[in-house]
Amino acid sequence: EWVKFAKPCREREDNSRRNPIAKITSDFQKNQKITYRISGVGIDQPPFGIFVVDPNNGDINITAIVDREETPSFLITCRALNALGQDVERPLILTVKILDVNDNPPIFSQTIFKGEIEENSASNSLVMILNATDADEPNHMNSKIAFKIVSQEPAGMSMFLISRNTGEVRTLTSSLDREQISSYHLVVSGADNDGTGLSTQCECSIKIKDVNDNFPVLRESQYSARIEENTLNAELLRFQVTDWDEEYTDNWLAVYFFTSGNEGNWFEIETDPRTNEGILKVVKALDYEQVQSMQFSIAVRNKAEFHQSVISQYRVQSTPVTIQVIDVREGISFRPPSKTFTVQRGVSTNKLVGYILGTYQATDEDTGKAASSVRYVLGRNDGGLLVIDSKTAQIKFVKNIDRDSTFIVNKTISAEVLAIDENTGKTSTGTIYVEVPSFNENCPSVVLEKKDICTSSPSVTLSVRTLDRGKYTGPYTVSLEEQPLKLPVMWTITTLNATSALLQAQQQVSPGVYNVPVIVKDNQDGLCDTPESLTLTVCQCDDRSMCRAPIPSREPNTYGESSWRLGP
């Protein structure tokens, strides 16, 4: 049977004067030699060697300082061994309790706590909760922390209180006003032993958040300005406003609005976000002949809603604005400012020279009729394609359009027309758009098998080749160009297969050079920018079908009409 006792030891103290702090004995000791052994944390597990046992009498001594925060109690396994090293008792677990000493101050979880609270908040509103811990024995006075506010900056009336036990910081008043004081700095102490023991301090930085509790107020009681008729203005007037709320926030940012007089939407007010000024813009031109003076009223509010503490006091304050309209000689303008012309279908892009598009005249603003004493010139005129009559404003082509023209956008070319008032020298500008015939990019070329044919057998094979096989959209129709003269048909075209045909003379032909104009159409009936002119030489041949002598050039004969079709 074990006989045992253990005294508690106090941390951070020399407990050796109380040794042995524990004693174990076995009643087997009466009749045999017993050796005592101990093990466990503080003995053969770190921290090593704190407790030692006298193997002969079972006295357990403490050898060094212990720390309750490291080891609140030591569980010592005790064994009683006989001479053979066998246990004579079941191992005993002996507990040595370590008594707490107030050796740890409270520790705040942060050195500076940051909090914020809206101005005008009700008293007792929660601002923040401070957190501190104490490593001494839990649920003991040594670890019981009491909080208190040591100081407040700016000093004066106390604005906050702290819960002694929970560390909750709350408002003491409902009169926090950011416009007066925008932040507070508190020093708070936490002391253990419920306020009388070891203490630590922390800082609290409390930001007072802005609410929209100040109305924007226009600095002037009325405004006036002058503007010439028929002009727009991006900044006719600036309205200044005073708002005490936090700058550059929605609580400060002014929103200007019309309360009356702008039903025609001539004016707009934009807020300059840097200065908070209202910029009055004229966005629709005013006509002196219709109105010589304009009166309207404006008011201002904030981008943010007003705070519930002041919203009931808000009244729309209308401020009058007077605008004088100044009469000016109005001059000329193009109405409409642009005009579109279309080139008739069937007119080829290489036959545009001299083609008249129409006229585009300026209007006299005072009379509303076509302007007189005006000289017309073209401004921008890409490629020099067009010309305008300086008096009549008639516009026509002076150049054909090249397939590779870079200034054709969406099958349209554009140019600028300037009307110069010869009385004042003032210029008005209009734009013309010309829709031009489309080029068929997929037109094939017609190739002759040979250039020379004999009078004895005047025929030659034609074949069609596309430039881009991937864009081939056949079948194509090839025909002789129709002639205005009612002449007998001289040539005929006969299909041979899907890609070739035979061009034959229908009557006796004399030696010479012949131009045969051919028209190619695709399956969408799109005209190509041809006719393509096929040049043939007809000559007297030898028995090997070779020309005997060079043929003098002669005017081309182009008669009749025939057609053939390639493809399926």
């Epitope: 060697g49 704190i50 060094a64």
Partner: antibody, heavy 127, light 110 residues
Framework: QVQLQESGPGPVKPSGTLSLTCGVS?????????WTWVRQPPGKGLEWIGE???????FLNPSLKSRVTISVDKSNNQFSLKLTSVTAADTAVYYC????????????????????WGRGTLVSVSS | ELVLTQPPSVSGTPGQRVTISCSGS????????VYWYQQLPGTAPKILIY???QRPAGVPDRFSASKSGTSASLAISGLRSEDEADYYC??????????FGGGTKLTVLQ
């Protein structure tokens, strides 16, 4: 369980400063231990450099004291070693260790030992 | 200079008993506890003996130690090949701080 890990910039030039950090993971550096630096030149024995307690108290090897600074960073749970004016003789594997250092009561000796070690990091001093 | 003196090397065959000595002065071994560390090749040291003659939990009882006056010794009985390592004694010196012995290389001969 608690682990220690040494880290540093690698080779140091003669007359330069050797800087090492020991990260403590799985436990708090504010526990009641002495956080220690020990070094071992290649093929030689162990040499105690010094130790620090979490409150900043230190014990330093008198022969190195003028060149050694040991500091503790509680917020990052680590402690550091700085050794200035180094020479080739400072080339060694540097270990950080957790030490127990308790003054014995009357009639009892002082406890001083290391129960937990880092893996060690080799620092070479050469130009 | 070293304050704790150890033999640079000792050797023995498997099963044999070997001892490693550590001698010093009254300022460390004489008045403070001696600790022994084992350092296996390529690893950090590990505590083998605390408070002169006590074994930490997990250390085999083949390892024993003693202290007498200003000297201490470590004995390893029933030598095994895995005992091949460097062994260091250490103690706190009231004037110099922590001191280690120069270390002893134990070779297990096959």
């Amino acid at each position: 369980q608690v682990q220690l890990q040494e880290s540093g910039p690698g080779p140091v030039k003669p007359s330069g400063t050797l800087s090492l950090t020991c990260g403590v993971s799985g436990g708090s550096i504010s526990s009641n231990h002495w956080w220690t630096w020990v070094r071992q030149p290649p093929g030689k024995g162990l040499e105690w450099i010094g130790e620090i307690y979490h409150n900043g108290s230190t014990f330093l090897n008198p022969s190195l004291k003028s060149r050694v600074t040991i500091s503790v960073d509680k917020s990052n749970n680590q402690f550091s070693l700085k050794l200035t004016s180094v020479t080739a003789a400072d080339t060694a594997v540097y270990y950080c260790a957790r030490g127990w250092h308790r003054t014995g009561f009357r009639g009892y000796p002082s406890h001083w030992y290391f129960d937990l070690w880092g893996r060690g990091t080799l620092v070479s001093v050469s130009s | 200079e070293l304050v704790l003196t150890q033999p640079p090397s000792v050797s023995g065959t498997p099963g044999q008993r070997v001892t490693i000595s550590c001698s010093g002065s009254s300022s460390h071994i004489g008045s403070n506890y001696v600790y022994w560390y084992q350092q296996l090749p390529g690893t950090a040291p590990k505590i083998l003996i605390y408070s002169n003659d006590q074994r930490p939990a997990g250390v085999p009882d083949r390892f024993s130690a003693s202290k007498s006056g200003t000297s201490a010794s470590l004995a390893i009985s029933g030598l095994r090949s895995e005992d091949e390592a460097d062994y260091y004694c250490a103690a706190w010196d009231d004037g110099q701080g922590g001191v280690f012995g120069g270390g002893t290389k134990l070779t297990v001969l096959q």
